[in-house]
């Protein structure tokens, strides 16, 4: 671990004098001397710290531009910036959240492992023998063949990843 | 008044160390940072290192941090500044000063020389 | 690291003169500098501390100007008292740096 420094936590070293840093929230205005305190004020609407400090100046929240797809997910204060999230049917293009893309839909012969959030685009798997999708969607999974057999029926045409089998009745043997 | 007294002249062998104190006097030793620097003949003054006396934490000049230690003893008021693996480039005076917005009290300075 | 220059080295004045010593930083240390006096028998004094406040003591003779990089000491109305060599130093930024000093003599 790295040796303690001359200011304790939640100081700062300037000038040859350990002064407080400020709280979330708040921002410096003046430095401690050797006669006063830090003087720190508390940030504007629509801005926010979220760290002890010694800026001048408070971040801007962030803007969840609509027309970007965006939307609030969680108002920003004085402490916290603004989340942003994806209208529904979209999701974000980076972690930051920036802008959003439309879900991707899983082709035929694909189905959706996992759907789609805010934050992350839907992931397709191909169909297993045994299971078929013929639709493009982002939220149909592959669905198994159907079971002549339940059904007192036999295959008649063998199921693929995109179709399903097709079942027709046994064959009557001929007296 | 605030006060810095230092400890005499040292004249030491290449490669040893050399311990300088700083006592202080006049004030609460360990609400003020105590800075220390170097000056060699006829020339400027260079930063060693600062320490705050009642935590003991303490920040060096990154130039010489390998060979300085900076302790001090709040039960005596006296700071410290030991340095070591001494070279004929160490000889100069060496000053502790208080903190407190810029380096506010000094001590007369402490005249290391090594040689051989 | 922060470089603090004073340009004149060495100047000579009359008693009673005005006398400005300059220092500029390599970068932007907002007011955090500090003047210093090292008399010729090596001691050494704060004068001004934040570019401007006159520290406890000082005669007001004494002052101090300057914001960001270019930073002024005045002495005014110069006695023989204040024979000695002038230091800037800042405090913006570890390392703490000094100015090369300006030593000031009597014509």
């Known amino acids: 671990p790295e040796p303690p420094t001359a200011c304790r936590e939640k100081q700062y070293l300037i000038n040859s004098q350990c002064c407080s840093l400020c709280q979330p929230g708040q921002k410096l205005v003046s430095d401690c001397t050797e006669f006063t305190e830090t003087e720190c004020l508390p940030c504007g609407e629509s801005e926010f710290l979220d760290t002890w400090n010694r800026e001048t100046h408070c971040h801007q929240h962030k803007y969840c531009d609509p027309n970007l797809g965006l939307r609030v997910q969680q108002k920003g204060t004085s402490e916290t910036d603004t989340i942003c999230t994806c209208e529904e049917g979209w999701h974000c293009t980076s972690e930051a959240c920036e802008s959003c893309v439309l879900h991707r839909s899983c082709s035929p012969g694909f189905g959706v492992k996992q759907i789609a959030t805010g934050v992350s685009d839907t992931i397709c798997e191909p169909c297993p023998v045994g299971f078929f999708s013929n639709v493009s969607s982002a939220f149909e999974k592959c669905h198994p063949w159907t079971s002549c057999e339940t059904k007192d029926l036999v295959v008649q045409q063998a199921g693929t990843n995109k179709t399903d089998v097709v079942c027709g009745p046994q064959d009557r043997l001929r007296a | 008044q605030v006060q810095l007294q230092q400890s005499g002249a040292e004249l030491v062998r290449p490669g040893t160390s050399v311990k300088v104190s700083c006592k202080a006097s006049?004030?609460?030793?360990?609400?003020?940072?105590i800075e220390w620097a170097k000056q060699r003949p006829g020339q400027g003054l260079e930063w060693i290192g600062v320490?705050?006396?009642?935590?003991?934490?303490?920040n060096y000049n990154e130039k010489i941090k390998d060979r300085a230690t900076l302790t001090a003893d709040k039960s005596s008021s006296t700071a410290y500044m030991q340095l070591s693996s001494l070279t004929s480039e160490d000889s100069a005076v060496y000053f502790c000063?208080?903190?407190?917005?810029?380096?506010?009290?000094w001590g007369q300075g402490t005249l290391v020389t090594v040689s051989a | 690291e922060i470089q603090l220059t004073q340009t004149t080295s060495s100047l000579s004045a009359s008693l009673g003169d005005r006398v400005t010593i300059s220092c500029r930083a390599s970068?932007?240390?907002?007011?955090?500098l500090n003047w210093y006096q090292q008399k010729p028998d090596g001691t050494i004094k704060l004068l001004l501390n934040?570019?401007?406040r006159l520290h406890s003591g000082v005669p007001s003779r004494f002052s101090g100007s300057g914001s960001g990089t270019d930073f002024f000491l005045t002495i005014s109305n110069l006695e023989q008292d204040d024979i000695a060599t002038y230091f800037c130093q800042q405090g913006s930024t570890l390392p703490w740096t000094f100015g090369g000093g300006t030593k000031l003599e009597i014509k």
């Open positions: 000063a208080r903190g407190g917005g810029g380096f506010t009290y």
């Open positions: 934040f570019a401007s």
């Open positions: 320490i705050n006396p009642g935590s003991g934490g303490s």
């Open positions: 006049g004030y609460a030793f360990s609400d003020y940072l």
């Open positions: 970068q932007d240390i907002s007011n955090y």
